[in-house]
Interface confidence: low
């Protein structure tokens, strides 16, 4: 996460509903209002949904959205007949825009789309489309649900009555009725070609406030194939100001979307603001928690025969639910031990929680770098065999990374285990969670949209052994926003090791003076729990409730023509001309705590995994670690700095070395293709030398790349 000090008063940010058309500009744009009347809000943390009511009183109303729709209690309404759609079958014009608003991805519709019927009071005009999604692997991301079942994505189309108002915004500001359709996207084994223009557009708005014209698409093709079965209820906007003015039409049947296409949603970035610190992070889990129905009645359409087909099958279908693709918590107790000078043994324990038993086998992936080449191998191990694997022919001049994934039925997989990094002939060991570059805006601060993390994500380092060392990356890689994907080994080697000044075949000692000794006091402490770094013999058993994952398939997301890379800019950014987006190095601030001298201290019990994460879940704070810190300006030239003992303790500079992108294209043909590692709890290294250093920052992040929380003490055993 990139943190920088905001040198000007914090701007308040408008609600998503505030997108409006600028009719005076030469180009029609989607704008986010920054008027003082529109308070800042977020999907988690201090400005999260439970706090919306403080600045938007309607958010505490009795007729709020979204809701869970219980089919058995929905009454058939004879007035809810076929929808009349007008213009939906036409191709969109080339003036249709998509924008990353920071809270959603919105499409401003520039053509005339009208809907009537379904009990709507008039003929309504479509204004915009918005999307809500989860965090990874088809996890629950929809706002509405049916019989408790949520979907990976919910698309919402908003309408207003043009006979009554000259604009959508006027209708909202005057608290008058608007219409909204909710469409669920369901995981399919096949790409949905109708979504191609949308998916392509998403790649052009990866960064906050980016906008792009969309290729022509047919709006009808984004709706369910059958429109006859829908629910109707009266509710609200699902974002502040939560006005209770929305006539909701929730379609029963979903629209297919493949995992490959879903990755485009998971690759979107946003910026979050906590006090005067802004952070760039993935935009994920952008759904409001569900609201009580209270005295409302949910109706269902009376279109003949529309409810007959496959109702039971549909209700029983587990695809798209929270733990649908992730079949278990990660394999735990990852260890790598040298058997001799040329062989290693990787061992692990079975996941603590199995959502969809049984585990059939395990996939062991390891990648390495040699002579600047990256290679990766994957093999499987039956679950009824010993949970260990031997890697022979280990080269002392190569960097190895290992990770394990449990494989369940129907190609369902667990999250990845910790990634263990191995390199021979290394004697100095340390652990931490952030590889850091601090920054402060100049007179003209860089746009937050230009400061997104690289695909490597945050890293947790643990290691042990002489002459061998091991490093675990607790969080691994998220999707590459540039459309290319670097291998684990390349990112760790080129970005992290080079950036920290490691040279040759070993990791040099790392002075504690390089790291700032304090962290910013951020309101985000309520967003995620800080966990202590534990220098013990095994990994934490499972992630806490806010644990998250961001796997992507290797090579996924690369489109034809997207591989051209410009030369590095000063920030080490790679610029991709086709999509006009930048994929800059992840720059993060970190604090340091020294290892305690005591041995054999009692370990706290691991936090149990929670398969049903919600936007509200797991928000806890650990008192007693509050520290104030302000970022300090640093040299931004990007030149190499070998940190030495004489360095100012409040300054950190790391060389920005971009990861080498692989040339693989996503083929979609190999279901066994390994995915990038997920975010996992911090490891506990096997053993640490006396001068080990611990850099502790909470790795559990709501949106996979959240604000830094308060530090917790490191321990040695």
């Amino acid at each position: 996460v990139l943190h920088y000090v905001v040198c000007f008063p914090a701007l308040t940010e408008g609600y998503v509903g505030a997108l409006h058309e600028n009719r005076h500009g030469s180009a029609v744009q989607i704008r986010r209002r920054k008027a003082s009347g529109d308070p800042y809000w977020a999907y988690s943390g201090a400005y999260g949904p439970e706090h919306w009511v403080t600045s938007s009183v309607s958010c505490g109303g009795r007729h709020q959205s979204p809701i869970d729709i219980l089919d058995q209690y929905a009454r058939v309404g004879e007035e809810y007949q076929e929808l009349q759609l007008d213009g939906f079958d036409n191709e969109s014009s080339n003036k249709t825009w998509m924008k990353n608003t920071g809270k959603t991805v919105a499409i401003l519709l520039k053509d005339d789309y009208f809907v009537s019927g379904a009990g709507l009071p008039g003929r309504f005009k479509a204004e915009k489309v918005e999307f809500h999604w989860g965090h990874s692997n088809g996890s629950a991301g929809s706002e509405h649900s049916i019989n408790g079942r949520r979907f990976p994505v919910e698309m919402q189309i908003f309408f207003y009555n043009p006979d009554d108002f000259d604009s959508f915004q006027t209708a909202i500001s005057e608290n008058r009725i608007i219409g909204a359709m909710a469409i669920f996207f369901q995981v399919s084994p096949r790409d949905n070609s109708a979504l191609d223009p949308i998916i392509h557009g998403l790649k052009g708005v990866v960064h906050h406030e980016k906008e792009t014209f969309l290729d022509p698409f047919v709006l009808r093709d984004l709706l369910p194939a059958s429109l006859g079965s829908y629910y109707r209820y009266t509710g609200s906007l699902t974002t502040p100001p939560c006005s209770e003015i929305v006539e909701w039409i929730v379609f029963r049947r979903p629209v297919p979307i493949s995992y490959h296409q879903l990755e485009a949603f998971y690759s979107i970035f946003t910026t979050e603001q906590q006090d005067h610190v802004k952070s760039v992070e993935y935009l994920r889990n952008n759904f409001r928690p569900q609201q009580r129905l209270h005295d409302r009645v949910v109706s269902k359409s009376a279109v003949r025969d529309s409810w007959n087909h496959d109702m039971t099958d549909f209700l029983e279908n587990p695809l798209g639910t929270e733990a649908s693709k992730v079949c278990s918590s990660p394999p735990i107790h990852m260890k790598v031990q040298p058997l001799n000078q040329t062989a290693l043994q990787v061992s692990w324990s079975q996941p603590e929680t199995i959502y969809h038993p049984p585990i059939m086998n395990y996939m062991i992936s390891y990648s390495w770098t040699k002579n600047e080449d990256e290679k990766e191998k994957t093999f499987t191990k039956d679950s009824d065999k010993d949970l260990k694997a031997t890697i022979s022919h280990v080269s002392p001049d190569s960097l190895y990374l290992f990770r394990v994934q449990a494989v369940c039925r129907n190609d369902m997989r667990s999250d990845f285990s910790q990634t263990m990094l191995f390199q021979a002939n290394t004697t100095r060991i340390f652990q931490g969670t952030r590889i850091v570059k601090t920054g402060v805006p100049t007179a003209s601060p860089a746009s937050s949209a230009d400061m997104a993390p690289i695909s490597s994500g945050s890293s947790t380092w643990t290691s042990s052994g002489i002459p061998f060392s091991f490093v675990s990356m607790a969080t691994g890689m998220g999707p590459s926003s540039s459309g290319s994907q670097a291998t684990v080994a390349s990112v760790v080697t080129s970005t992290l090791l080079a950036g920290l000044g490691f040279g040759g075949g070993g990791i040099s000692s790392f002075p504690s003076t390089v790291w700032p000794t304090r962290l910013p006091t951020a309101a985000s402490a309520s967003k995620q729990a800080a966990r202590p770094v534990l220098a013990t013999t095994e990994a934490l058993a499972s992630p806490g409730p806010d644990g998250d994952s961001s796997p992507t398939k290797d090579g996924e997301g690369t489109e034809e023509g997207e591989k051209d890379e410009k030369s590095e800019s000063e920030d080490g950014e790679r610029e991709h001309e086709e999509d006009g987006e930048k994929d800059s190095e992840k720059k993060e601030k970190s604090g340091v705590t020294h290892a305690a001298e005591e041995r054999n201290q009692t370990e706290p019990s691991p936090t149990p995994s929670s398969p049903n994460r919600t936007a509200e879940g797991g928000h806890q704070t650990i008192p007693g670690h509050e520290q104030d810190h302000t970022a300090v300006p640093t040299d931004q030239t990007g030149g190499r700095r070998d940190a030495g003992p004489g360095l100012d303790p409040d300054m950190v500079t790391s060389t920005q070395v971009p990861p080498t992108a692989t040339e693989e294209q996503y083929a979609g043909s190999d279901p066994k293709r390994p995915e990038m590692p997920s975010k996992k709890p911090m490891s506990r290294g096997d053993r640490f030398s006396e001068d080990s250093r611990f850099i502790t920052v909470n790795p559990a992040e709501k949106n996979t790349s959240g604000m830094i929380s308060r530090p917790a003490p490191g321990r040695m055993e």
Epitope: P189, R190, D310
Partner: antibody
């Protein structure tokens, strides 16, 4: 709800042939439709499907040899250049709308004989 | 390419229970469907997603899956159950999606 194949006949090798599946009782905009064939005395062999949006997917061996298309009420299978190995009964089938890989409605089939 | 293996033929006594198997290297990660085909007729879907039974299919037919083997079990076999039985699953995803049928098992009821 029913399916009926037509167009099966005796053709000489290399002569393109189009089979048609006519649907009734449901809309092709809501379902994927597949073609499966069965050579005499042999097992079922999946050729390909066309989904509700018109995207087509083919078996590896069938790519280039077959083309699937559709209108509002029919699904066509074109055998671009038949060989004697293409002699079989051709079935069209409707794919379950929520569960892929399963066909819950089948036509009776139409026989294609390729012989010189 | 992905191959589903079924025994060519299986015999069962009237009223007895019989299990038909379908195996593949990575079937543990996929759902299997089962079809019944009687001579001169089109196939009929019996089981989908390993264990689910469409309406109208007698509950004598059940599906299960363990490891790399999917199993169709017919309890209380009847003369009318004599037919060919095919398993099927999908291979690949996204644009490379395809469906695969097993070679079929001829069930004889004696």
């Amino acid at each position: 709800q029913s399916l009926e194949e037509s167009g099966g006949r005796l053709v000489t090798p290399g002569t393109p042939l189009t089979l048609t599946c006519t649907v009734s009782g449901f809309s092709l905009s809501s379902y994927a439709m597949g073609w499966v064939r069965q050579a005499p005395g042999k097992g079922l062999e999946w050729i390909g499907i066309i989904d509700s949006r018109g995207s087509t997917y083919y078996a590896t061996w069938a790519k280039g040899r077959f083309t699937i298309s559709k209108t509002s009420t029919t699904v066509d299978l074109k055998i671009t250049s038949p060989t004697t190995e293409d002699t079989a009964t051709y079935f069209c089938a409707r794919e379950d709308s929520y569960y892929y890989d399963s066909f819950n409605l089948w036509g009776p089939g139409t026989l294609v004989t390729v012989s010189s | 390419s992905f191959v589903l293996t079924q025994p060519a033929s299986v015999q069962v006594n009237l009223g007895q229970t019989v299990s038909l198997t379908c195996t593949a290297d990575t079937l543990s990660r996929r759902y299997a469907s089962w079809y019944q085909q009687k001579p001169g007729q089109a196939p009929v879907l019996l089981i989908y997603r390993d264990t689910s039974r469409p309406s109208g299919v007698p509950d004598r037919f059940s599906g299960s899956s363990s490891g790399n083997t999917a199993t169709l079990t017919i309890s209380g076999a009847q003369a009318g159950d004599e037919a060919d039985y095919y398993c099927a699953t999908s291979d690949g995803s996204g644009s490379s999606y395809q469906c695969v049928f097993g070679g079929g098992t001829q069930l004889t009821v004696t």
